[in-house]
Amino acid sequence: LIIGFGISGRHSITVTTVASAGNIGEDGILSCTFEPDIKLSDIVIQWLKEGVLGLVHEFKEGKDELSEQDEMFRGRTAVFADQVIVGNASLRLKNVQLTDAGTYKCYIITSKGKGNANLEYKTGAFSMPEVNVDYNASSETLRCEAPRWFPQPTVVWASQVDQGANFSEVSNTSFELNSENVTMKVVSVLYNVTINNTYSCMIENDIAKATGDIKVTESEIKRRSHLQLLNSKAS
């Protein structure tokens, strides 16, 4: 038995990415961090996308090097140049497109070594819902509206008083295509609401989950909304 020990070696650096989602038409961030280097000129950052021939972005010797950038990313990418020295290789992606979804690789070369990590980037549309009392309706009615969603989400109503109740029979949800023919406006109406109760309108697709709460009492109306991106996993 002959055993060989590899004598030539290369150092490896740790690169960390976080799966994230982009809101189409807006700017997005692809997160990547690495073990920092002392000299900015020794750091090379390359962003690649699975199935795309050219580079997404390259930062080299302290500045962008975009000669090999793929056409689909032209003019839409930037790193946070002042943060590269502290190990931030995150990419800002302007005007996120549906087609930007996919697997990206953050590839780092420094004087300490090389490293890379992949991240899954989902794209869609998501927005905060607003719940209001519909005073035009014949009975006590709540109207939940969210301007931009894609893919088509599910809408579920819940109430603090009637926990576990199914409101599908007393609600009506519609989806209206927006002018750019991709995203949709979500409108959901809940009928027969009672006073002194808190109602929640929950909108969810595979990218995001948003909730609009409304508390209706005889003297006041309180509203609260929050949005959560799903599947943010580090690798």
């Epitope: 290369r10 490896s12 690649l48 699975e50 021939l53 690789k105 090389k114 890379n116 992949n118």
Partner: antibody, heavy 123, light 104 residues
């Protein structure tokens, strides 16, 4: 520091199966191609094949019918098996790490090598 | 299969000389080419990847150029440590036949 340690039988008889293993130390296993290359005495380098951490393989068509490359991610190891060896398979066999990944259009060369295992096939 | 043809197969040169080695691919491989240096009894060492990118730690006297089917490795001023055999390699597979750089 990323290092490759390879081992396996150095002397084989014709028709036997060559078996070599390469262990990866000091670095990640995913995001790279893990390759086998050989060099017959006094000749050039011949690429045998490669595998990634998911077990996807590519083989040299001239050796494909006899080659199996496998991976054990729990041990950070990959292995080569070459069946029905003849004297023509006598060579120094190297394992190497290559900067590349399936689905991505980039290849950054074989930057880490084992020091090689001399395999002699003789009756 | 894409074939890589290196020329010359042997090159005699003196210290200080400018040396150029050529690698031709039988069909276009874009810029997916690497260059290696190998000394007797040792494993090859990566010099250049993606046709023209110098591997970290490799002296700047080495440079690579070309794309498509024609590639070159240039040593601007040959040093005693550079006498070795050089190989080109296409995208994670085949190698060229090698060029031995020997002392004139």
């Amino acid at each position: 520091q990323v290092q490759l340690q390879q081992w396996g039988a150095g002397l084989l008889k014709p028709s036997e199966t060559l078996s070599l293993t390469c262990a990866v130390y000091g670095g990640p296993f995913s995001g790279y191609f893990w390759s086998w290359i050989r060099q017959p005495p006094g000749k050039g380098l011949e690429w045998i094949g490669e595998i990634n951490h998911s077990g996807n393989t590519n083989y040299n068509p001239s050796l494909k019918s006899r080659v199996t490359i496998s991976v054990d991610t729990s041990k950070n190891q990959f292995s080569l098996k070459l069946s029905s060896v003849t004297a023509a398979d006598t060579a120094v066999y190297y394992c190497a790490r290559a900067g590349g990944d399936y689905g991505f259009y980039y290849y950054y060369g074989m930057d880490v090598w084992g020091q090689g295992t001399t395999v002699t096939v003789s009756s | 299969d894409i074939q890589l043809t290196q020329s010359p197969s042997t090159l005699s040169a003196s210290v200080g000389d400018r040396v150029t080695i050529t690698c031709r691919a039988s069909q276009s491989i874009s810029s997916w080419l690497a260059w290696y240096q190998q000394k007797p009894g040792k494993a090859p060492e990566l010099l250049v990847y993606k046709a023209s990118r110098l591997e970290s730690g490799v002296p700047s006297r080495f440079s690579g150029s070309g794309s498509g089917t024609e590639f070159t490795l240039t040593i601007s001023s040959l040093q005693p440590d550079d006498f070795a055999t050089y190989y080109c390699q296409q995208y994670n597979s085949y190698f060229g036949g090698g060029t031995k750089v020997e002392i004139k």
